[in-house]
């Protein structure tokens, strides 16, 4: 399982006070950003449990590992789910807490309830604050069952649940009718996909025994361990205050784990630290107990002492969970709870074990899991010891599970589980990734997806020219970086392969598929320079240049020219494609700019150097507006324009261009040329009575200038439906006469 | 699809007996509280009685206390209205109805099409 | 025990806004659940918990409730709404079921 721990701190007198901790024990765990580990997520679920909106929770990382919440600031705001995902890939697990309000008018008996498939789950909720009606219970949010307030048993309000099927597991709930649902009873059920004591898919494995309250994982048989446990049957005490799967962990604070709920990826849920209990974890165990929760009872045997935090402390000279086994018994000695190796390799491993009579070397055997058994190939014999090393056949997957170290003397037997996990050489699924190339040197992504097991720990990067049968050149890389391939040929293809490999004898994985990377051209290295340039428009530009003349042939495709417009912060480039051009025509350029212009060789996609920059002024575009348009309606079909000519002109005026358009009209605008610009007055005909026009113009010189203003102005009369504007102009004497 | 059928209406003289079934599918039948809803001809709506889903706890409307008895089968999906010493003013169609919780209040989201009693001499 | 007391009738235009209230002592303290009947028809709910709506029912119909009025409003009235309607509540006091005398709502 997922070493995962969510901490909920439970001394309630201050909301503000109260926080939650996720604490992951995995390798690399939250690091985020790269591929190998993503991130610690902690969050609160209100999918099921809304609680009214306050201020944002404060989330903080404390390094890679460890991530906290914090900023509640009612009561109610701790109401509810909250959640901590952690682990990567498949091993990716959602830890989830359940907190009530202890003001509630309902509280759970016992808020996480582990059950096994086709069990009868119990739910019990305890009144607090009597109300007489209905209590309604809910699962995951929806309506599940009625109770009328006469059904309380002792005090309880009680839900049975016959038959449980894993899609029974989630939130449950126990509300009175008409009651804020902060006040509920929240419970959490969490149903085993397999019946008591298997595992696996058909549910047809055994589970291992875990011991201390430990719980068989459905998927793996692994022991979920209770906090303060470890071992592969969660055999072994942590020392006071500590946890996760290797007992890493601290508790916070002066007084250890009091007043902290744990909470452990499924099946397990969440319980108080080893040795303390109660709804809020702040009491001690009684004597004679210990544990999670306080949950198991210690009944030493021959003068043992309990401690609530490890159960029997034995005197000299005697061993076991109750103290019941003399020292005479041969005991196998620090035993490994799991061991790692890789596929096909041939490990050797050891077991020590002590004893009278002493353990030679044929009463130590080592056993399989498909119940081969294995004798040592050699002992080292200590005062206070015997160690048996074990040569182990090739492994194959099917070695992976618990193996079982025994020994056995006249004085009697011990053995100890360990499991042993059996992983597989990570071979890349995919081809490195080209990120870059220049002609001498390929920069490499070898970050790919890869099947077998990770970590991964180094990375190496084959390569070799293509077609060729020389040695592969090999570079070992950081997991997480990009790698630079550097002294290669210009414009030459390698075939680019990936082997990775995980910790370990024999980690190294096949190597994966190849690809083809080809290096870039040679660098054009002529520089330039700008011959001349002149404008032939307010909107293009000639620009002619030279190159150096060197012997041998060019080494280039074309050109770049690069024209940049400093006031918008713009940059054009033209493509001219013929490395034997030498002029080019720019069009569509912006009147009245300031442009600095270079041009560079280019060959394939590598730019030579730019020749020294050239600045460029642009005639400013068309004049002026157009002054004092006026539009006069003349009869039901026609509106005469009256304007004075624009002031300060850059040259003659060519023409006028009116432009009509219907008020409110959603069609395109019309453009009238007024094609004698000494004009100051035109009439539009053909327009439709009773119609309100919208009216403006401009002059051209070189190009269109300014709009002028917009005027408004509506047709007479009702006349006939016209065929569409016309213009005719006059003098504007004359216009005004008529 | 939920569905409530009711049956067992008819006409019947004042001081005698009948006993309505209403069948229900498509939800958990056994864990929901029901209840009778009955409706005199051009008159409104009345509430008759309620059952738990449990079936152990029954509610009944004053008007029909202590002649009236709310059951439920939960093997059969069937709920059921023994009424005694029938009287005219019983005259009514009889709808079954399912008690729902939105939040934590109650109302009936799904009701029968209803049987016609009738109490005549 | 609990009463709740409704106009017996409300005219409304096609195309306008229907009130029908619902009176109560203290009824802004209750949950108020509104159904419509259509003749011959079973009692369909319109409204549930003062002003939820369930999946199905057009938006036109909303509720509300405080003091001693519970309210269902539709908007923009069409021929189909022309029914009758009776709110609801739960008497926790008493543990029963109480209705309204029913509106007759016609569209004009």
């Known amino acids: 399982a997922v070493d995962l721990t969510l901490l909920a701190n439970l001394r309630l007198t201050d909301p503000q006070r109260f926080f939650l901790t996720c604490v992951s024990g995995e390798a690399g765990a939250g690091r985020g950003s790269d591929a190998w580990g993503p991130p610690l997520l902690l969050e609160k679920d209100d999918r099921i449990v809304r609680t009214p909106p306050g201020p944002p929770l404060r989330l903080a990382r404390n390094g890679s590992h460890q991530v906290t919440l914090r900023g509640f600031s009612k009561p109610s705001d701790l109401v509810g789910v909250f959640s901590c995902v952690g682990g990567a890939g498949a091993r990716r697990t959602r830890v989830i807490y359940v907190h009530n309000s202890p003001g509630a008018h309902l509280l759970p008996d016992k808020v996480t309830h582990t059950v096994n498939k086709g069990d009868t789950a119990v739910l019990s909720a305890r009144v607090h604050k009597e109300k007489q009606t209905d209590v309604i219970w809910k699962s995951n949010g929806s309506y599940f069952y009625t109770l009328d307030w006469h059904e309380a048993q002792d005090g309880r309000f009680l839900l049975q649940l016959p038959n449980v099927q894993p899609p029974s597991s989630g939130i449950y709930s126990a509300t009175y009718l008409e009651a804020s649902p902060l006040g509920s009873a929240f419970f959490r059920l969490i149903v085993r996909g397999c019946g008591a004591g298997r595992w696996g898919p058909g549910c047809t494995k055994e589970c291992p025994g875990c011991l201390h309250g430990g719980v068989c994982h459905d998927h793996d048989g692994e022991c979920v361990c209770p906090p303060g446990f470890t071992g592969t049957r969660c055999e072994q005490a942590c020392r006071e205050g500590r946890f996760g799967q290797s007992c890493q962990e601290q508790c916070p604070g002066i007084s250890g784990c009091r007043g902290l709920t744990f909470c452990l990826p499924d099946p397990y849920g969440c319980s108080c630290g080893s040795g303390w209990r109660g709804s809020q974890c702040q009491e001690a165990c009684a004597p004679g107990h210990f544990g999670a929760d306080c949950r198991l009872q210690c009944q030493c045997q021959n003068g043992g002492t309990c401690d609530r935090f490890s159960g029997c402390v034995c005197p000299s000279g005697w061993h076991g969970v109750h103290c019941e086994k003399s020292d005479r018994i041969p005991q196998i000695l620090n035993m490994a709870s799991e061991l790692e190796f890789n596929l096909e390799t041939m490990p050797r491993i050891n077991c020590a074990a002590a004893g009278n009579p002493f353990p030679v070397r044929g009463s130590i055997e080592l056993r399989k899991p498909d119940g081969t058994v294995l004798l040592s190939t050699k002992a080292i014999v200590e005062p206070e010891k015997t160690t048996a090393e074990f040569e182990v056949p090739r492994l194959v997957l099917a070695d992976s599970g618990f193996w079982e170290c025994r020994v056995s003397t006249s004085g009697g037997q011990d053995s100890r589980r360990f499991k042993v996990n059996v992983k597989v050489p990570p071979v890349p699924l995919a081809a490195p990734r080209l990120l870059t190339k220049q002609s001498r040197q390929l920069v490499v992504s070898p970050l790919v997806s890869f099947s077998g097991d990770g970590p991964i720990s180094t990375v190496r990067l084959h390569y070799r020219p293509q077609d060729s049968t020389m040695d592969w050149s090999t570079i070992v890389v950081d997991p997480s970086e990009n790698v630079t391939l550097m002294n290669l040929r210009p414009k030459t293809g390698y075939s680019v392969r990936v082997q990775l490999s995980r910790p370990g004898e024999g980690g190294e994985g096949a190597w994966g598929p190849p690809t083809l990377m080809t290096t870039d051209c040679p660098e054009p290295l002529l520089q330039p320079w700008l011959e001349g340039w002149h404008v032939e428009g307010t909107d293009r530009l000639r620009v002619s240049w030279s190159l150096p003349l060197v012997p041998g042939p060019l080494v280039g495709d074309g050109f770049l020219l690069r024209l940049w417009d400093g006031t918008r912060g713009q940059e054009r480039r033209e493509n001219v494609s013929s490395p034997q051009a030498r002029t080019a025509l720019l069009t569509g350029l912006t009147p009245g700019t300031h442009y600095q212009l270079d041009v560079q060789l280019y060959h394939c996609t590598l730019l030579g150097p730019a020749s020294p920059p050239a600045h460029v002024l642009l005639p400013p575009s068309g004049p002026p507006a157009p002054r004092h348009l006026h539009a006069q309606a003349l009869s039901d079909s026609e509106i005469q324009l009256t304007w004075k000519h624009p002031e300060a002109l850059p040259g003659p005026i060519s023409k006028y261009v009116v432009e009509v358009q219907v008020a409110g009209g959603a069609g395109d605008p019309l453009w009238i040329d007024v094609d004698r610009p000494e004009e100051t007055s035109t009439i539009i005909r053909g327009l439709n009575a009773s119609t309100r026009y919208l009216f403006r113009m401009r002059a051209s010189i070189q190009g269109l200038g300014d709009w002028s203003n917009t005027v408004e102005e509506s047709t007479l009369g009702n006349g006939l439906q016209a065929e569409g504007p016309v213009q005719e102009s006059r003098a504007a004497e004359e216009g005004l006469d008529q | 699809e939920v569905q409530l059928l009711e049956s067992g209406g008819g006409l019947v003289q004042p001081g005698g007996s009948l006993r309505l079934s209403c069948a229900a599918s498509?939800?958990?039948?056994?864990?929901?509280?029901m209840g009778w809803v009955r409706q005199a001809p051009g008159k409104g709506l009345e509430w008759v009685s309620s059952?738990?889903?449990?079936?152990?706890?029954?509610r009944y409307a004053d008007s029909v206390k202590g002649r009236f008895t709310i059951s439920r089968d939960n093997s059969k999906n069937t709920l059921y209205l023994q009424m005694n010493s029938l009287r005219a003013e019983d005259t009514a169609v009889y709808y079954c109805a399912r008690n729902f919780v939105e939040s934590s209040h109650y109302y009936h989201d799904y009701w029968g099409q209803g049987t016609l009693v009738t109490v005549s001499s | 025990q609990y009463e709740l007391t409704q106009p017996p009738s409300v005219s409304v235009a096609p195309g306008q806004t229907a009130r029908i209230t619902c009176g109560g002592n203290?009824?802004?303290?209750?949950?108020v659940n509104w159904y419509q009947q259509k003749p011959g028809q079973a009692p369909v709910l319109v409204v549930y918990?003062?002003?939820g709506r369930p999946s199905g029912i057009p938006q036109r119909f909303s509720g509300s409730n405080s003091g001693n009025t519970a309210t269902l409003t539709i908007n923009r009235v069409e021929a189909g709404d022309e029914a009758d309607y009776y709110c609801q509540v739960w008497d926790s006091g008493s543990d029963h079921w109480v209705f309204g005398g029913g509106t007759k709502l016609t569209v004009l």
């Open positions: 918990d003062d002003s």
């Open positions: 059952i738990y889903p449990s079936g152990g706890f029954t």
């Open positions: 203290n009824i802004g303290i209750k949950s």
């Open positions: 498509g939800f958990t039948f056994s864990h929901y509280k």
